[in-house]
């Protein structure tokens, strides 16, 4: 709100721009015939200090000189960096109701002289780009500071550009707008940056460079790859580059990888052969360029080329297992199962599996292809059968994996001993065993196989298995292991033509069952009572049931009930008890026990034995 200084003037000594820590004198003078009245003694000049448009101080007490009614001089000290506004006002003491009238104002800028610019760095992006330099200006000056970038070179080449820094913009980079060409490759150029403001000036040290020092090639473009004879492991990477490029750096990696393969290529001329690619793998390729073998800078990495290498025929062998069951008097059903190859073995999209089932002596052969990882056939029970499976993609098939079809649990002498299953954590079970005691043929391998103890489809829910070398006696099973589910686990010992197995049940985590078995009937036969029940539904078992308990007590009795504990067997659903008195009414119920504890009781049934009990 400063009028155009009609009433007077304000001046600053030594200047309106001062170094940090300096004092200044501000004089406020009224023009002739300006003032409150014809009595000069009633004119009072005051000085107000504003920072960011906010009044921060009345400098009435800082007067150092006063010509009553005409002019006053104030000394200001401890000014902070930046700009401070001072406004002189006229206060008419005989009219206290009127506010002071503005006379004039002045801005004082406090700052520092510029430091010599440092760390000059110049670049020219590409052979056809222009030279741009950047620098570190040093401490903020808080004043408008002009920077001049000067370049000099051979053949009296000179060039300069300017910019300024103030509180709104920063000047630490300038594009000179000139292009250095490759024919000046050996020439030396000098740049210098000069900084000037009202408090002083400074210059950088001269910075010397050559064409090669500053020209950063453009990143390669138009990147493509050609796979030789549709090979999945060999390809020629091609790209476009600026003409002067002599060195390239290539980096490539599978998309899910975290580390790059790096290659340096000299005089590649936009072409490089790669020989170690993985077939049927998504890769990312990038290229960088340099104009000189020893000096100069690398370009930025090119845009990525993302592509998938072609397929190659599968390698590796399938992990096969099987299940056999007799389905009538002279036929058996063989269900073959196998695990998918991992991507590095499949080397492409597996289109189908070739399955062969062969009777060795009669040379009967059944062959088929399937897209599934299982295959089932009914074959005669007689003869020695062998199975083989291979995986095929668009380029070919893997070598077939063979397995002899033997009676997996047929040889007691091959049965592993002391099989145990111990829960390790929520999702795995440690299975351990001892080798067969009197095997009449050498164990070639162990197979640990497991299935959930709940109803499932033979073909829809294949078994899970692990192959274990013959010198190992333990396996940690984790595939498809869920807490609170009981698994039947078999350890098979396989020789060339025989198999023996041992079974155990195990779970990874257990709770007490939700309920007890449901007693369905109590019958009396030959002075014994038979208790029949239905098993607890699988979801309510919550782990492996170790045993059932049958409780009974006389009706209305307050005594502790008697109980009979029976080993859990899924095939058993009745049990005899013989210690009940005839013509006494009893209440009976059942519970189930896991390693975590006992279930609540199942339903209660009353029964009064009639016959003579033991």
């Amino acid at each position: 709100n400063i009028d155009v200084c009609k009433l007077g003037t304000v001046t600053v000594q030594p200047a309106p721009v001062i170094p940090l820590g300096s004092a200044a004198n501000i004089s406020c003078s009224l023009n002739p015939k300006q003032g409150c009245s014809h009595y000069p003694s009633s004119n009072e000049l005051i000085l107000l200090k504003f920072v960011n448009d906010v009044l921060v101080e009345n400098l009435h007490g800082k007067k150092v000189h006063d010509h009553t009614g005409h002019s006053s001089t104030f000394q200001v000290t401890n000014l902070s960096l930046g700009m401070t506004l001072f406004v002189c006002k006229l206060n008419c003491s005989n009219s206290q109701k009127k506010p002071p009238v503005p006379v004039c104002g002045v801005e004082i800028s406090v700052g520092v002289a510029p430091e010599p610019p440092q760390n000059i760095s110049c670049v020219q992006e590409g052979e056809n780009g222009t030279v741009a330099c950047s620098w570190n200006s040093g401490k903020v000056t808080y004043l408008k500071t002009n920077y001049t970038l000067q370049l000099s070179g051979p053949n009296n080449l000179t060039c300069q550009k300017q910019c300024f820094s103030d509180n709104r913009q920063n000047c630490n980079r300038l594009d000179l707008g000139i292009n250095l060409s490759p024919d000046l490759a050996e020439s030396r150029f000098i740049v210098r940056v000069t900084a000037i403001n009202d408090l002083g000036n400074s210059s950088s040290l001269p910075h010397t460079f050559t064409f090669l020092d500053i020209v950063i090639p453009l990143p390669p473009w138009d990147i493509r790859i050609n796979f030789l004879n549709a090979s999945g492991s060999r390809g020629t990477l091609q790209w476009e580059d600026e003409g002067q490029v002599v060195l390239n750096q290539l980096r490539y990696q599978p998309l899910n990888s975290t580390s790059w393969n790096m290659v340096n290529a000299t005089n590649a001329k936009g072409k490089y052969d790669l020989r170690d690619l993985r077939p049927f793998t998504e890769y990312e390729f990038q290229i960088s360029s340099k104009l000189h073998l020893s000096g100069g800078s690398w370009s930025n990495w090119s845009e990525s080329l993302r592509t998938r290498t072609p397929e190659e025929e599968p390698v590796g062998i399938l992990d096969i297992w099987y299940m056999k069951q007799d389905i009538d008097y002279d036929r058996q059903q063989i269900s073959l199962f196998w695990k998918s190859l991992n991507p590095s073995e499949a080397r492409g999209k597996i289109l189908h599996y070739q399955v062969t089932l062969q009777e060795v002596t009669k040379k009967t052969t059944l062959q088929n292809t399937t897209r599934h990882t299982s295959w089932t056939r009914v074959i005669p029970r007689t003869g020695a059968w062998t199975a083989s499976v291979s995986a095929a993609n668009s380029k070919g098939a893997s070598a077939p994996t063979h397995i002899n079809i033997v009676d997996l649990c047929g040889t007691g002498l091959l049965a592993p001993h002391q099989v145990s299953a111990k829960s390790e954590n929520m999702d795995n079970i440690l299975v351990t065993w001892q080798p067969p005691k009197k095997a009449d043929s050498a164990v070639r391998e162990y197979i640990v196989e497991w299935r959930a103890l709940q109803p499932g489809s033979i073909t829809k829910f294949p078994p899970h298995w692990l192959r274990i070398p013959p010198d190992n006696m333990s396996a940690l099973i984790s595939e498809n292991i869920k807490p609170y589910i009981c698994y039947e686990i078999r350890v098979h010992a396989l020789s060339e033509s025989q198999g023996g197995c041992s079974s155990i049940r195990g779970d990874s985590k257990h709770k007490a069952p939700v309920s007890g078995p449901h007693i369905t009937a109590i019958t009396e036969k030959k002075e014994r009572l038979f208790i029949s029940w239905t098993h607890i539904p699988f979801p309510e078992q919550r782990g492996c049931i170790l045993h059932y308990r049958i409780y009974w007590k006389e009706r209305d009795s307050t005594a502790q009930p008697e109980l009979c504990e029976i080993q859990y067997r899924r095939s058993q659903n009745s049990h005899p008890i013989s210690s009940l008195q005839p013509r006494v009414t009893y209440v009976l119920w059942m519970t189930a026990v896991t390693a975590a504890g006992e279930s609540p009781q199942g339903n209660e049934r009353e029964f009064c034995p009639q016959g003579k009990a033991n």
Epitope: Q325, S457, I458, T459, S571
Partner: nanobody, 119 residues
Framework: QVQLQESGGGLVQPGGSLTLSCTAS????????MYWYRQAPGKQREFVAY???????NYLDSVNGRFTISRDNAKNSVYLQMNSLKPEDTAVYYC?????????????WGQGTQVTVSS
């Protein structure tokens, strides 16, 4: 438990056709592997055909090409289409379902339906 009910049997002339049906009820959530068996008078029960959860089928050699097994999951039913029937196909035909619990196979049987091939 699972209950199986066959139907569709009867008397047919040699060269004729019949379609047997089997409908499952009860706890059938895990019954995916369905079979047909037959038992001729004075002979042991023999496997005829099966169909798996993935609709893969297999047949007794002597009926292969003449009989076709199929299923309709929405109706919990399995069918045996029998063409070019011969007198030696005369038997009681049984529907069978198998499921596995651990390593134990549970089997369920229907009561059978009589097929007689005679002129």
């Amino acid at each position: 438990q699972v209950q199986l009910q066959e139907s569709g049997g009867g008397l047919v002339q040699p060269g004729g056709s019949l379609t047997l049906s089997c409908t499952a009820s009860g706890s059938i959530f895990a019954i995916d592997d369905m079979y047909w068996y037959r038992q001729a008078p004075g002979k042991q029960r023999e496997f005829v055909a099966y169909i798996t959860a993935t609709n893969s089928a297999n047949y007794l050699d002597s009926v292969n090409g003449r009989f076709t097994i199929s299923r309709d999951n929405a109706k919990n039913s399995v069918y045996l289409q029998m063409n070019s029937l011969k007198p030696e196909d005369t038997a009681v035909y049984y529907c069978n379902a198998k499921q596995i619990v651990g390593f134990q196979i549970d089997e369920y049987w229907g009561q059978g339906t009589q097929v007689t091939v005679s002129s």
